[in-house]
Interface confidence: low
């Protein structure tokens, strides 16, 4: 019968002919009366056999990532009779892996959006690197992820590539971060190869700022001839948030005379002071009212940022008009 062991050849071998092993018949007594032949894909071009001894050699550099195994056939013939000594047999040459591929991030570019002020531990995104080396061959394709840029705001789970928040961030201070992740094979041991990727992390706005009046005192005037409904001036607050988180509503907090009203212009986010009742210079020539401003939408969990509404004082002078 045939005698052989499992055949392995390391990929990327630089030797011109690398001895892989020996195929032989147990009827071969070593007197060169038998001839060994190799057939199949790669026979004669990638692999050669010593026809006398059955020793097999690789004569080309092999790339496991291109082809990981070769299935060949062997024959042994009695030179004197030309007859087969053994039935033709199939055997396998496996190409063993070396760590010749660096991890690659196949999904670039990475981009994620996460709400500002998210708590520590919040999942941002998972980055995944791929290594063309053999996952079953030692640690050649076992990856470890690490953070090269992004501390102290982010962390990465070493084995999964999951990026999490490690420190609260305020969009109003910085609205985007570039994080650089490295994937290293060989679980970081000597001889490891690495690849890096960048992740753009954008902070989305949450309503963590209340609107605040630009001025603590506004001075307005109104003619005593002004009809009710007249706009007598505008007041303005600012809000560091954006979008609907910066939408605000103005209202009267104090107006003993109940003469004025404030409506909100939702396009400009200004408060418009309106005359609710006609004024009479001779009766009262000035008024003092207090206005307040609040955000339009405030989720329950963010109420802590909106405990006391900002207020402002408005002094309104009535202008005299000659009466017949």
């Amino acid at each position: 019968g045939w005698v052989w062991n499992q055949f392995f050849v390391p990929e990327e071998m630089n030797t011109t002919s690398h001895h892989i092993g020996q195929l032989r018949s147990d009827l071969d007594n070593g007197n060169n009366s038998f001839q060994y032949k190799l057939l199949g894909a790669g026979a004669g071009s990638t692999f050669i056999i010593d026809e006398r001894t059955g020793d097999i050699y690789a004569i080309q550099k092999l790339d496991r990532e291109e082809r990981s195994l070769y299935i060949l056939r062997a024959q042994v013939i009695d030179i004197a009779t030309g007859r087969a000594v053994e039935p033709e047999s199939e055997f396998v040459i496996k190409v063993s892996d070396i760590n010749d591929n660096e991890p690659k991030f196949l999904d670039e570019p990475y981009e994620a959006i996460v709400p500002e002020m998210s708590p520590e531990g919040t999942l941002v995104i998972q980055v995944t690197a791929s290594d063309a080396d053999d996952p079953s061959s030692g640690n050649n394709a076992r990856l470890l992820y690490s953070l090269l840029q992004g501390q102290p705001y982010f962390s990465v789970e070493p084995t999964t590539g999951v990026i999490r928040i490690s420190s609260k961030m305020d969009r109003e201070l910085q609205d985007e971060y570039w994080v650089i992740i490295q994937a290293k094979d060989m679980i970081g041991q000597p001889g490891a190869l690495s690849g890096t990727t960048s992740v753009l992390i954008k902070l989305s706005d949450v309503n963590d700022n209340k609107p605040i009046f630009k001025e603590s005192l506004y001075r307005l005037t109104v003619s005593e001839s002004a009809p009710t409904g007249t706009s007598i001036g505008t007041i303005m607050a600012y809000d560091n948030d954006i979008g609907e988180n910066a939408e605000m509503d103005y209202s009267i907090e104090e107006d003993d005379s109940q003469t004025f009203d404030i409506i909100t212009n939702h396009e400009t986010q200004e408060g418009i002071v309106i005359l609710k009742k006609k004024v009479d210079f001779e009766h009262q020539n000035h008024y003092g009212i207090r206005a307040k401003v609040k955000n339009h939408h405030v989720p329950e969990q963010l109420m802590k940022y909106h405990t006391e509404a900002s207020t402002t004082f408005i002094k309104i002078q009535v202008e005299d008009v000659d009466e017949p």
Partner: antibody, heavy 120, light 110 residues
Framework: QVQLVQSGAEVKKPGASVKVSCKAS????????MSWVRQAPGQGLEWMGI????????TYAQKFQGRVTMTGDTSTSTVYMELSSLRSEDTAVYYC?????????????WGQGTLVTVSS | QSVLTQPPSASGTPGQRVTISCSGS????????VNWYQQLPGTAPKLLIY???QRPSGVPDRFSGSKSGTSASLAISGLQSEDEADYYC???????????FGGGTKLTVL
């Protein structure tokens, strides 16, 4: 554990269209391809097409070209498959299946299936 | 007519070893990873073997996959009654620019 939840059973008339949804959760929706596979009663599995939710890139099986449209909504982590000009032979269970981060990687999670019946 | 050819049926007795073959071409099995799916009656398919021979967690080591050239096979050793199901091979086809499934093999445990 990744979850794919599909919309409920539908009964349609020949010539009509059907739109099946597949809501994904517990993974980064924009990182993985999503395929649609159907199975007619008593028959084998038939691949219909694939979509990458982040860019909306699609590849459809030749057989369904012009009749199928796959879309994704990243805000709700949902993919949709719309099949038009329905005929009785479109009666099948339609599955969504999560692919890999590359087009040629295996489908590791499957939805529960949506039965679409086409009958006059 | 499926691009990948599987035997329509296979059977075995409990404890036996059963092999299901899947034959394709250079553009599919010859150049891409083979995956196997198990479909129990009335349920969605489940990934059984991926990238030729890898088992997802939870799949018993009684199931194994192999690939050679343009053919692949799924082996089930120590057959159990709960293995009665339909088995499908699937692979990406470079010529078709899409996925192809085998016609499926109905496994009966006698």
């Amino acid at each position: 554990q990744v979850q794919l939840v599909q919309s409920g059973a539908e009964v349609k008339k020949p010539g009509a269209s059907v739109k099946v949804s597949c809501k994904a959760s517990r993974y980064t929706f924009t990182s993985y391809y999503m395929s649609w596979v159907r199975q007619a009663p008593g028959q084998g599995l038939e691949w219909m097409g694939i979509i990458h939710p982040s860019g909306g890139d699609t590849t459809y099986a030749q057989k369904f070209q012009g009749r199928v449209t796959m879309t994704g909504d990243t805000s709700t982590s949902t993919v949709y498959m719309e099949l038009s000009s329905l005929r009785s032979e479109d009666t099948a269970v339609y599955y969504c299946a999560r692919g890999g981060i590359k087009l040629w990687l295996h489908f590791d999670y499957w939805g529960q299936g949506t039965l679409v019946t086409v009958s006059s | 007519q499926s691009v990948l050819t599987q035997p329509p049926s296979a059977s075995g007795t409990p404890g036996q070893r059963v092999t299901i073959s899947c034959s394709g071409s250079r553009s599919n099995i010859g150049s891409n990873f083979v995956n196997w799916y198990q479909q129990l009656p009335g349920t969605a398919p489940k990934l059984l073997i991926y990238t030729n021979n890898q088992r997802p967690s939870g799949v018993p080591d009684r199931f194994s996959g192999s690939k050679s050239g343009t053919s692949a096979s799924l082996a089930i050793s120590g057959l159990q009654s709960e293995d009665e199901a339909d088995y499908y091979c699937a692979v990406y086809d470079d010529s078709l620019n899409g996925w192809v499934f085998g016609g499926g093999t109905k496994l009966t445990v006698l």
